[in-house]
Interface confidence: medium
Amino acid sequence: DTHKSEVAHRFKDLGEEHFKGLVLVAFSQYLQQCPFEEHVKLVNEVTEFAKTCVADESAENCDKSLHTLFGDKLCTVATLRETYGEMADCCAKQEPERNECFLQHKDDNPNLPPLVRPEVDVMCTAFHDNEATFLKKYLYEVARRHPYFYAPELLFFAARYKAAFAECCQAADKAACLLPKLDELRDEGKASSAKQRLKCASLQKFGDRAFKAWAVARLSQKFPKAEFAEVSKLVTDLTKVHTECCHGDLLECADDRADLAKYMCENQDSISSKLKECCDKPLLEKSHCLAEVENDEMPADLPSLAADYVESKDVCKNYAEAKDVFLGMFLYEYARRHPDYSVMLLLRLAKAYEATLEKCCAAADPHECYAKVFDEFQPLVEEPQNLVKQNCELFEQLGEYKFQNALLVRYTKKVPQVSTPTLVEVSRNLGKVGAKCCKLPEAKRMPCAEDYLSVVLNRLCVLHEKTPVSEKVTKCCTESLVNRRPCFSALELDEAYVPKAFNAETFTFHADMCTLSEKEKQVKKQTALVELVKHKPKATKEQLKGVMDNFAAFVEKCCKADDKEACFAEEGPKFVAASQAALA
């Protein structure tokens, strides 16, 4: 389905509003340091050009690819070399190498100031004064901080952001209306960004076979009544959508996502009974709803898997005919029967099944060899079950903050070379698994917990890839996508690590501690905890607890003092000395 002008095709399909939003997101994700005004100027130029192509598809340059058009536009930025250094060298390349070069320079941890939320009245005034600019600013700020954010989904977030302001800026108590909505959008946005980052890592580091396997397992759990043929079609289409978005082809991605939503809604009967309420919604909401839809009920009469995958005389014949199709069918059949398993566990089972067939189909008596293959699954299933059980018990015993601290200690001992901010961020997020998953019924705990942990550990892998410091982390991150979490779980105290020299400056605190929010105070304390473990990796739980309790008491005392700074100056050195003695 070729078009004379790709840019005109996408403009007509998407409409001006979505076209402009997506181009702004694309440019902001590539040039993360550029000022807002610069991006708006570039987007307006591209939009005007697109309109000329809509009017006449044969007009000059309208036949160029989107990569060529967008890349040429990005390369007109005057300060490219000063701001981005070697990224400017991308502009000397031809497509498709130029786009690949831009992709490689996307920065998962850009050096940008944290977003500060202004007063509600200030935000409402800005919203009313120029709604379009206000919403563009939101797209720009989120996209540049999250260069892999799922672009069509970001348009949905922007629509919700707009709706929140439209409603709350009219309310009697603007803050009470708006702030919870903004908090929810922020938290959901961070989660959405992290989930999409794992999809892109899966595609980019492990290939589309890995992504397709993940998608077969997840969609089979969601749509257990759908046939394998239907699931396969959805997987193929979904892979195309995510490949495009992860590759920076945001217009194509959004267009194809809309087509997929249309297809699903037109074929609900052969997919799932749960799609109905999604399909009545407008496009952005509909696509979001379909992506988040709950699992359909499992068909009542599913036969045992053993007949087709263990007992049948045709197992090796079918496997040899088309390995990936046969394994895909196995994964589909297993996943639709097990909504209680994590996707990662299902993929491990498929890998184990594949390894058994590879070995047994070359044996003298294949059937005898693979007859007990399902017994080999038991330890693979029990490992995450036990892990979830133990960690949920610990979470219920400690509460979220102390559970995070336990994980901080655990992970710092495993990989002490990793930077302290990364260990704090990752361990805090690992710790959130408790509140997110442990309250769920037993059948939903493992898929919630392990698949969430996979997303968080991917963040560790992505940050570590930028500045590699630990061979253990590199090994766990690169050897196997499905075994990342078990690989990290299996790491022990790093005996080769040379403890970090004690630095009193790291443990020096000031009165500004008292004005911090509860979350910021926790981060300060957790940063100190990581540094303590790096200094004394063999410190016991009791020793660390004693030091942290003393720290909390010292901060509380000084924050109640009349002269807070004087108290910190006097009590700080005492706390440091006492801590060193306690850990000696």
């Epitope: 046939e227 394998f228 043929a229 079609k233 005919e321 088309a322 069918m329």
Partner: nanobody
């Protein structure tokens, strides 16, 4: 346009065997997902067995597993169904259907097959 022509039906005693054939023209049979369905009087069309396009991955209804075998001969552009240990409940008109849009994958839903033969009657009775 795809044409399908079934043959090989007839009357057979319980426990007996039959081999049905489905000759295709207008498209190579190995490029499409093909399947055998059957329809007993007063009932809907029921999936019996299928074979993927391009690869010989076979699918069977639980009721016929171990008794029926689907295969094809690409040189003759023909699909077969070998039926052993026939039972009275196997009595039906047997149809072959083809689904060119999705190689590798057969479906158990009759509506997804755009092309059908006219059917061949199989009667299992003593």
């Amino acid at each position: 346009e795809v044409q399908l022509l079934e043959s090989g039906g007839g009357l057979v005693q319980p426990g007996g065997s039959l081999r049905l054939s489905c000759a295709a023209s207008g498209r190579y049979i190995d490029e499409t997902a093909v399947a055998w369905f059957r329809q007993a009087p007063g009932k809907g069309r029921e999936f019996v067995a299928g074979i993927g396009g391009g690869v010989d991955i076979t699918y069977y209804a639980d009721s016929v597993k171990g008794r029926f075998t689907i295969s094809r001969d690409n040189s003759k552009n023909t699909l077969y169904l070998q039926m052993n240990s026939l039972r009275p409940e196997d009595t039906a008109v047997y149809y072959c259907g083809t689904r060119p849009g999705r190689p590798l994958i057969t479906s158990k839903v009759a509506d997804l097959y755009p092309y059908w033969g006219q059917g061949t009657l199989v009667t299992v009775s003593s």
